[in-house]
Interface confidence: medium
Amino acid sequence: VLPRWRQQWSGSGTTSRFPETVLARCVKYTEVHPEMRHVDCQSVWDAFKGAFISKYPCNITEEDYQPLVKLGTQTVPCNKTLLWSRIKDLAHQFTQVQRDMFTLEDMLLGYLADDLTWCGEFNTFEINYQSCPDWRKDCSNNPVSVFWKTVSRRFAETACGVVHVMLNGSRSKIFDKNSTFGSVEVHNLQPEKVQALEAWVIHGGREDSRDLCQDPTIKELESIISKRNIRFFCKNIYRPDKFLQCVKNPEDSSCLSGI
């Protein structure tokens, strides 16, 4: 039997054991988060699968993910949303300590998909473990990119109160309009629910002289946010290690001075 022709994409293929990983993560999440104990993980996997299986992987839409989004509906208390851009690791360390704040990856759907890749093939029930479309080289409407765009939009839309965003001060563009934060989340914060956006600009080392809140890209972010009738604040986090430590132990004497 001749092997069936398979589309070759530029990106890496579906993460090995993808179905098992998603199902296991779902079970673990619902066990740890009592408010989600009603979630049927088999239904979640079926909805996830239904979003991309048998579909041309360059023609995925946000609509494809709506059944999954519906099953994974979760609310974050006001003032407790933490967005991030190009600094996922620190944002996640922060919410591991500050347990009452949440990144997208602390929510069920973000947790299920974090660091995973997936895609299917048109008109077959197979998962493509060989290659998946690359956002730049192949297409932007691929299963992974559309998923993150969909859930990021929803996460931003449901945020309320003061929303925080962690930005990487080591980058040439501290605020990047092409990032998920810059292209999706910023534009989906709801002015009638969100009073303010507070940016935390994370410095890369011990050089505490520069005020990165004066960076032109931060001014651009301030302009975008202000035009949407949301107040904007910015803080330099000069010592990220101290910042994490002081979140853990705010009473420490060294935390009374600036971080």
């Epitope: 890369g204 011990r206 050089e207 420490d252 060294s254 935390c255």
Partner: antibody, heavy 118, light 109 residues
């Protein structure tokens, strides 16, 4: 592949000088604070010096202050340690290691041996 | 004499759980994040734990914790390949320096 490669070690007489280099590959060198850590034969790890991402801040262990100078060239992805007025107690394997302030020193070189002896 | 104090040696049999302690002061362990490094014989140190987290590739048998001015590294399900020297490290605000523990030599019996 992410790696650091040290060079420049060798045998030198007390009072002599050496310059160690550490070449970085596979990561954005200019995003990381860099360090030199040494280990004397049969002993534990001892921090020697650190330099911030652009080089505006440097720190030294008391044992090397005034004798060693750390520097970096971000355009060449290279870290340096100029060691002057070397003493027998400076004999050690010298490692360079990168540092991100919420990660720790997560990439280490293989080390270069400095022997100070007459 | 190291600023951070570790026991010079520790041992355990395969499958056992072993804990290595690291004692310091408010200017280092209490006020800053603690890292743990593993050094296998004849090799460079390797980051094992940062901020009580494991870098990718480090087995979940290794865990770190901190309480006040002390930190500890726990290794469960001990394996022969865990035989190595283990070092704790933290930034010291008073010394303006990285400080390391003297190291603990772990023997798997």
């Amino acid at each position: 592949e992410v790696q650091l490669l040290e060079s420049g070690g060798g045998l030198v007489q007390p009072g002599g000088s050496l310059r160690l280099s550490c070449a970085a590959f596979g990561f954005t060198f200019s995003d990381y604070e860099m360090n030199w850590v040494r280990q004397a034969p049969g002993k534990g790890l001892e921090w020697v010096s650190s330099i911030s991402i652009t080089g505006s801040w440097t720190g030294y262990a008391d044992s090397v202050k005034g004798r060693f100078t750390i520097s970096r060239d971000n355009s060449k992805n290279t870290l340096y340690l100029q060691m002057n007025n070397l003493r027998a107690e400076d004999t050690a394997v010298y490692y360079c290691a990168n540092y991100k302030s919420y990660y720790g020193m997560d990439v280490w070189g293989q080390g270069t041996t400095v022997t100070v002896s007459s | 004499q190291s600023v951070l104090t570790q026991p010079p040696s520790a041992s355990g049999t395969p499958g056992q759980r072993v804990t290595i302690s690291c004692s310091g002061s408010s200017s280092n362990i209490r006020n800053n994040l603690v890292n743990w490094y593993q050094q296998l014989p004849g090799t460079a140190p390797k980051l094992l734990i940062y901020n009580a987290q494991r870098p990718s590739g480090v087995p979940d048998r290794f865990s770190g914790s901190k309480s006040g001015t002390s930190a500890s590294l726990a290794i469960s399900g001990l394996q022969s390949e865990d035989e190595a020297d283990y070092y704790c490290a933290a930034w010291d605000d008073s010394l303006n320096a990285w400080v390391f523990g003297g190291g603990t030599k772990l023997t798997v019996l």
